[in-house]
Amino acid sequence: MMTGTIETTGNISAEKGGSIILQCHLSSTTAQVTQVNWEQQDQLLAICNADLGWHISPSFKDRVAPGPGLGLTLQSLTVNDTGEYFCIYHTYPDGTYTGRIFLEVLESSVAEHGARFQIP
């Protein structure tokens, strides 16, 4: 039975040209995390493999940095970066947990962070 929950940074906003940290945290399970995939819609951004480390997809190599932790830092944000981001935790023996973050990239200088929320 999957008992874990994914806590994410929820709905967040950031300024165009700035940077943002996408962060997820898996809790309430003793399952071993084997790999975390970061995806934007159906596009792979990055992989963090427990044994092998990080892989950043080539199309994001100049503006995505690994970390902190299992999170991902997006840099040089554009309005086109607005959308859904998913952290997909592959665990043993539980299976797969998925967290969702919605990022809005704003033209204005007013960019507020949303509240944290949980996805069972």
Partner: antibody
Framework: EVQLVESGGGLVKPGGSLRLSCAAS????????MSWVRQAPGKGLEWVGR??????????DYAAPVKGRFTISRDDSKNTLYLQMNSLKTEDTAVYCC????????????WGQGTLVTVSS | PYELTQAPSVSVSPGQAASITCSGD??????ACWYQQKPGQSPVLVIY???KRPSGIPERFSGSNSGNTATLTISGTQAMDEADYYC?????????FGGGTKLTVL
């Protein structure tokens, strides 16, 4: 030590089929994205296709000349990669090698010696 | 289909720097890899992810990739570097090899 050993090559008639295997050792095979690459006699390298790890969907991608005829699969429990080749053509004659896609800094292993596939009547 | 273009041959004197280029549309948006192949031997990865060197590859091998061009540079070229060099464009959906460049050390 990372090692890849290909087998299953041989002589086959045009229109025939063949299944190649690649036995992997020295690394956690299930984590790796794996490709097949071929080299015709006296020619350059040609990518055939790849299969991603199960944790990245286990999906496959193929080069245009083999799409619909070749199928890549993997058995992580046996640390083995496969290439099923159907409807073979004379232009498929080549040495076939399996390779580790260079995603990760600590997993960029050497190529095997390959296995020769000859398609001829 | 995506294509990569390499010069068929490059010549260099021992001790000099050799540059081998590879061009393709928006190649800088992909990862460039470089393979060295000597006669009768399997290819060896010398550069991956544009500029990274696998363990065991000498420091004289370096790589860069931006715009439409990837470049493999061998500083202080040695006779043992004479080989065919293949560039490779790598991304999450496809892989393509260039036609290869024969490096001759005069």
């Amino acid at each position: 030590e990372v090692q890849l050993v290909e087998s299953g090559g041989g002589l086959v008639k045009p229109g025939g089929s063949l299944r190649l295997s690649c036995a992997a050792s020295g690394f956690t095979f299930s984590n790796a994205w794996m490709s097949w690459v071929r080299q015709a006699p006296g020619k350059g390298l040609e990518w055939v296709g790849r299969i991603k790890s199960k944790t990245n969907g286990g999906t496959t991608d193929y080069a245009a000349p083999v799409k619909g005829r070749f199928t890549i699969s993997r058995d992580d429990s046996k640390n083995t990669l496969y290439l099923q080749m159907n409807s073979l053509k004379t232009e498929d004659t080549a040495v076939y090698c399996c390779t580790i896609d260079p995603l990760y800094d600590i997993l960029t292993g050497p190529w095997g010696q390959g296995t020769l596939v000859t398609v001829s009547s | 289909p995506y294509e990569l273009t390499q010069a068929p041959s490059v010549s260099v004197s021992p001790g000099q720097a050799a540059s081998i280029t590879c061009s393709g549309d928006k190649l800088g948006d992909k990862y460039a890899c470089w393979y060295q192949q000597k006669p009768g031997q399997s290819p060896v990865l010398v550069i991956y992810q544009d500029s990274k060197r696998p363990s065991g590859i000498p420091e004289r091998f370096s790589g860069s990739n931006s715009g439409n061009t990837a470049t493999l540079t061998i500083s202080g070229t040695q006779a043992m570097d004479e080989a065919d060099y293949y560039c490779q464009a790598w991304d999450s959906s496809t892989v393509v090899f260039g036609g290869g460049t024969k490096l001759t050390v005069l």
